[in-house]
Amino acid sequence: DGCKDIFMKNEILSASQPFAFNCTFPPITSGEVSVTWYKNSSKIPVSKIIQSRIHQDETWILFLPMEWGDSGVYQCVIKGRDSCHRIHVNLTVFEKHWCDTSIGGLPNLSDEYKQILHLGKDDSLTCHLHFPKSCVLGPIKWYKDCNEIKGERFTVLETRLLVSNVSAEDRGNYACQAILTHSGKQYEVLNGITVSITERAGYGGSVPKIIYPKNHSIEVQLGTTLIVDCNVTDTKDNTNLRCWRVNNTLVDDYYDESKRIREGVETHVSFREHNLYTVNITFLEVKMEDYGLPFMCHAGVSTAYIILQLPAPDFR
């Protein structure tokens, strides 16, 4: 029949929920073409009647919903003025339970997507919802380990879950859920996402280790001068920022007027496997207002603090 065959990768899907596949193969579909869907080399095209559970919607094949028996090879034939391409798509449908449905967990999942969040970054997960214009998608809800996600670090934006300052605890099993409306009927779409965390840290490129300080207090007399080192080990190729902060502000900015407390110039010693960095903080004169405040040393995503403390009175 003169059609060129193109084989797509297998799509593995979950039963009991909507699924759609768009027959696009640029640059073939960029011009004037006709698209027709078939199942298992049948000569009869997939129905275009929108009430049919399986039907063609423009260039899409739409399953409302997908059922276990829908597994098989589907072909879409793209005919242009001087060309013909037949695209083969292998769909495998199976039952998948993300949470135990017998205890009221979430229903069946579609694709087990794999996504990566980057440690220390503001990153995001995407809910992949590919449907034709005739399908209207409602707001997306996000779950982690079967519980709806809430909290300051998480923001839902369109099809994405934004995660600020990613931590190791953010790895795990996620799901995004949306209600799809088509011809007045509602269907639930639920995509499972397995999330891993890259150890490549966010604002630098590795996870530095702060050797000193160690989140402790230092006894110091009022009015004295004090210099405290922050010692950090990090990889030789790192691009991490190392600095001292107070009240979430760089000390040089916080004491911009008085310049009473300053950050020193960073130095480093190179070892075979790593570098040892030192950046100090200098208190020209310790004042009452300095006591009890955490002065934070930051190195990439790592932090450690010192707290100045008045020496205990000597009653000897």
């Epitope: 503001d122 990153d123 300051e152 934004l162 190729d237 691009t239 979430n248």
Partner: antibody, heavy 118, light 107 residues
């Protein structure tokens, strides 16, 4: 619709100061990190400062560190850039931008022009 | 500081062409590369985030790829409205740095 409106730009002498403001609407301002980005007369883009959503962290390039301070007022949906000790090389169009994820500046204001000249 | 080398600085192409712009980082930036478009007299517009992810509403003729140090931005079937300037931005480590820009021109 997300809108960002910058103000506070103008002509200033070298060594002078300016405070830029950026009023945000149409978005939950407090949930997003914000940046200031400038464009030089030669059309080069330069990152100037970033502040985290909760006002906890601020970041600057060495070229402005110690001279510029980024801050925000989440109650009033406003971002600021305090610029001190201005130099001729700070002459640029200054844009504020909402950051969706790291480096992903999805919404930009129309910009405010800062000219540093004697 | 990570230096971003964007090439070419200018590029002549015909409508319907596929064009490619590259950004090379002076060190590994993982996937932390964003692409922006700026039309004359307009503000920069986000096209692609995290090297290959298309921002909402951006036509699929725009695409991005790469990780580590070498990144590619492609426009397939160039349209008249695409004839403008494009910038890359690395946000792996501070200070964040932009490429010098690529100006597209019509052949």
């Amino acid at each position: 619709e997300v809108m960002l409106v910058e103000s506070g730009g103008g002509l200033v002498k070298p060594g002078g100061s300016l405070k830029l403001s950026c009023a945000a609407s149409g978005i939950t301002f407090s949930r997003f990190a914000m940046s200031w980005i400038r464009q030089t007369p030669e059309k080069r883009l330069e990152w100037v400062a970033t502040i985290s959503s909760g006002d906890m962290y601020t970041y600057y390039p060495d070229s402005v560190k110690g001279r510029f301070t980024i801050s925000r007022d989440n109650a009033n949906n406003t971002l600021y850039l305090q610029m001190r000790s201005l130099r001729s090389e700070d002459t640029a169009m200054y844009y504020c931008a909402i950051m969706i994820t790291t480096g992903e500046h999805a919404y930009w204001g129309q910009g405010t022009l800062v000219t540093v000249s004697a | 500081e990570i230096k971003m080398t964007q090439s070419p600085s200018s590029l002549s192409a015909s409508l319907g062409d596929t064009i490619t712009i590259t950004c090379r980082a002076s060190q590994d930036i993982s996937v932390w590369l964003t692409w922006y478009q700026q039309k004359p007299g307009n503000i920069p517009k986000l096209l692609i985030y995290k090297a290959s992810n298309l921002h909402t509403g951006v036509p699929p003729r725009f695409s991005g790829s790469g990780s580590g140090t070498d990144f590619t931005f492609t426009i397939s079937s160039l349209q008249p409205e695409d004839i403008t300037t494009y910038y890359c931005l690395q946000s792996q480590s501070y200070p964040w740095t932009f490429g010098g820009g690529t100006k597209l021109e019509i052949k």
